[in-house]
Interface confidence: low
């Protein structure tokens, strides 16, 4: 199934010449950025990007790798070193501190320098670091957070929270001793630390008092409110803001995003994380692309610009389950959101970055034929004379023994959305990986994204590009299209 034209050297020479021509025409934009968008693919290592590219291409009836993703079209790329101050292989909390605040932290802490210690409440005060989103708000921009996880989850929390424990979602998760020392849960910080204009994702249950039934699952007690302090945080958030609207389903989101009277929007579409894209009820829950579009509609009204954080947060969850199908379909929806945002914004005034917080021990190998299913089998057999999949994990729940040996696998099994790819080491959850991840950039000052950088560089590029603290004396021309 090799395309005939690809057998001809002219095909490759022509294709490369076009790419070279485009590269030669690249002109670094010397203006400041009016808008900042950071797209965060949680757990989206380079192997995930490659595999998702092939899957997306194959969904369009192509062979796969030749069709670029939306993120592939960003002209500038760098590598980001993701380690935490105390760990070679990081978590999503301390990495969020790095790419959102510009300072590295310790494993499982958020919005704190490395002087703060995991789970030690009394090390919080004085060690807070301020996110670029917070700085953008102080500069008069509108700001938004969009995620497929809980809005209180580690990555989105990096935009607004300061906590020594990323798992302190609601006050019920915070030990009494820490509460007495004044440490606040992440949900409380969401509504009180700063004024966020758009908040979209999951995480309803952390906002309401214990015993409050969930509107979508009123008969399931486990999905109801978790708070012990009796607070209704959504109501408090609404009460503080003129023009605030709360929604919990797709229909209400679409209506609110078109309503000119809505100035602040909180949409929480699931009690916890949002459903995987393959399980999403499209009548009730919006997709990441739809949430991104709704956020951009509201944020774009501000003449001073906006900061938007968009997370494909469940790429990571799919990998932790060793279910590549879930991880890759989440990555494709993430890429769709990037594509839609590109249609709704201009690279003349918007700096868009795409990156991952960390990678996963997810591999793609075995010499599969071009055009064969990304979820398929390698052409040959392993030494145990059994088939193996081209996608595998170094560790995780996919390690299973059948009669003391590695089980055989068929193409129909491996193609199932529920299939767990095999791994070398048995773990309840597959782990993150420590290799560098890609950073893709487009728009004003995107040319600064080059080489191999610390993950913290990302936050500094955004701050500099928009002339935010500590780069208010950035000496950049005003963003394209502005008059002041």
């Amino acid at each position: 199934i090799i395309p005939v034209e690809e057998e001809n050297p002219d095909f490759w020479n022509r294709e490369a010449a076009e790419a070279l021509g485009a590269a030669k025409k690249l002109q670094p934009a010397q203006t400041a950025a009016k808008n900042l968008i950071i797209f965060l693919g949680d757990g989206m290592g380079v192997s995930t990007v490659t595999a998702a590219r092939i899957l997306k291409g194959q969904k369009k009836d192509k062979l796969g790798p030749e069709i670029p993703l939306a993120m592939d079209r960003f002209p500038y790329v760098a590598l980001s070193k993701t380690y935490n101050v105390d760990k070679h292989v990081p978590d999503s909390g301390a990495t969020a501190t790095a790419y959102l605040c510009g300072v590295k932290g310790n494993f499982q802490t958020i919005g704190l320098s490395a002087a703060a210690r995991f789970n030690q409440c009394n090390t919080t005060r004085g060690n807070e670091v301020i996110s670029v989103m917070n700085r953008a708000k102080k500069a008069g921009k509108s700001v938004g957070v969009v995620t497929t996880t809980r809005v209180q989850h580690a990555s989105p929390a990096g935009t607004y929270a300061h906590t020594v424990n990323r798992n302190w979602y609601s006050d019920a998760d915070v030990p009494a001793s820490a509460r007495q020392e004044g440490c606040q849960d992440i949900a409380t910080q969401l509504i009180s630390n700063m004024d966020i204009d758009v908040i979209l994702g999951g995480g309803r249950k952390y906002m309401f008092r214990m015993g409050t039934p969930d509107p979508e699952y009123p008969d399931d007690y486990s999905q109801g409110g978790t708070r012990l302090d009796g607070k209704n945080l959504v109501q408090e958030w609404l009460a503080k803001r003129q023009g605030a609207r709360y929604v919990w389903n797709r229909t209400e989101l679409m209506q609110a995003s078109l309503d000119p009277s809505v100035t602040h929007l909180m949409g929480l579409f699931e009690p916890g994380d949002m459903k995987y894209e393959i399980h999403r009820d499209s009548t009730l829950d919006p997709s990441l692309m739809e949430m991104t579009e709704a956020a951009l509609r509201l944020l774009s009204r501000n003449p001073r610009g906006f900061f938007l954080f968009v997370e494909g947060g469940r790429i990571d969850h799919g990998h932790h389950e060793s279910r590549a199908y879930r991880a890759l379909t989440e990555t494709i929806m993430f890429d769709d959101a990037i594509e839609r945002a590109g249609q709704l914004t201009s690279e003349e005034d918007t700096l868009s970055l795409v990156t991952a917080d960390h990678s996963h021990v997810f591999s793609f190998g075995g010499y599969p034929l071009r055009g064969s299913s990304i979820f398929g089998l390698a052409p040959g057999k392993a030494r145990d004379r059994k088939a193996y999949t081209v996608l595998l994990y170094g560790n995780g729940p996919g390690y299973v023994l059948k009669d003391g040996a590695r089980p055989d696998v068929t193409e129909s099994e491996s193609g199932s959305p529920e299939y767990r790819q095999q791994s070398a080491v048995p773990l309840d959850e597959e782990t993150h990986a420590g290799e560098d991840v890609a950073v893709f950039a487009r728009g004003p000052q995107a040319h600064l994204v080059h080489g191999v950088q610390e993950q913290t560089f990302i936050a500094h590029v955004m701050a500099f590009a928009a002339c935010l603290e500590p780069y208010t004396a950035c000496d950049l021309a005003p963003p394209a299209g502005t008059t002041d």
Partner: antibody, heavy 123, light 106 residues
Framework: EVQLVESGGGLVQPGRSLRLSCTAS????????MSWVRQAPGKGLEWLAL??????????EYSASVKGRFTISRDNSKSILYLQMNSLKTEDTAVYYC??????????????WGQGTLVTVSS | DTQMTQSPSSLSASVGDRVTITCQAS??????IAWYQQKPGKAPKLLIY???SLQPGVPSRFSGSGSGTDYTFTISSLQPEDIATYYC????????FGQGTKLEIK
Amino acid sequence: EVQLVESGGGLVQPGRSLRLSCTASGFTFTDYYMSWVRQAPGKGLEWLALIRNKATGYTTEYSASVKGRFTISRDNSKSILYLQMNSLKTEDTAVYYCARASFYYDGKVLAYWGQGTLVTVSS
Amino acid sequence: DTQMTQSPSSLSASVGDRVTITCQASQDINKYIAWYQQKPGKAPKLLIYYTSSLQPGVPSRFSGSGSGTDYTFTISSLQPEDIATYYCLQYDNLYTFGQGTKLEIK
């Protein structure tokens, strides 16, 4: 379980005053907007007054028909809502309900109601 | 002040019928409308809030729709226990109730 119990109603002469109480239980009283609504015999519902929650400094609002005569207040330590009614008129005869804002997300929609207390203004 | 005009003031329908009540606001209320059911001698009961959101525990035969100034409340298949008076409430700008619709069985 959310419970609202009104009391203080009864027969009162025109021009006199009366104070209604609404004792709340089963929820964190300070977190919720509270309102008074009345219903004259055989008539529809009429909203009278609102007192907001702790997050908004317990600010108050009134309908034009009672502004200046009625005062809404709350004793947060006892979880009691009050309606002080002065210069009563015969047209104030009604069942008076206290109502609590939504269990859910919009702090203003009236989701929980007491059983009502009857106020009769007559000479 | 926002005024709410509810119609009809009364209606008679048979069990199984589709019943529709409308409320018109004097200005855009941004979908902040709720619908209540009240039976004689009882307090009102919230059925629907924010135009179309069904309060938990309320049967799915009750629904709401609308935007701007025009809103509709529907009972898809009237049941004997639905006999009551129904009120709309706007809560965009403080509160205003509609005049009520008394629903009877034919």
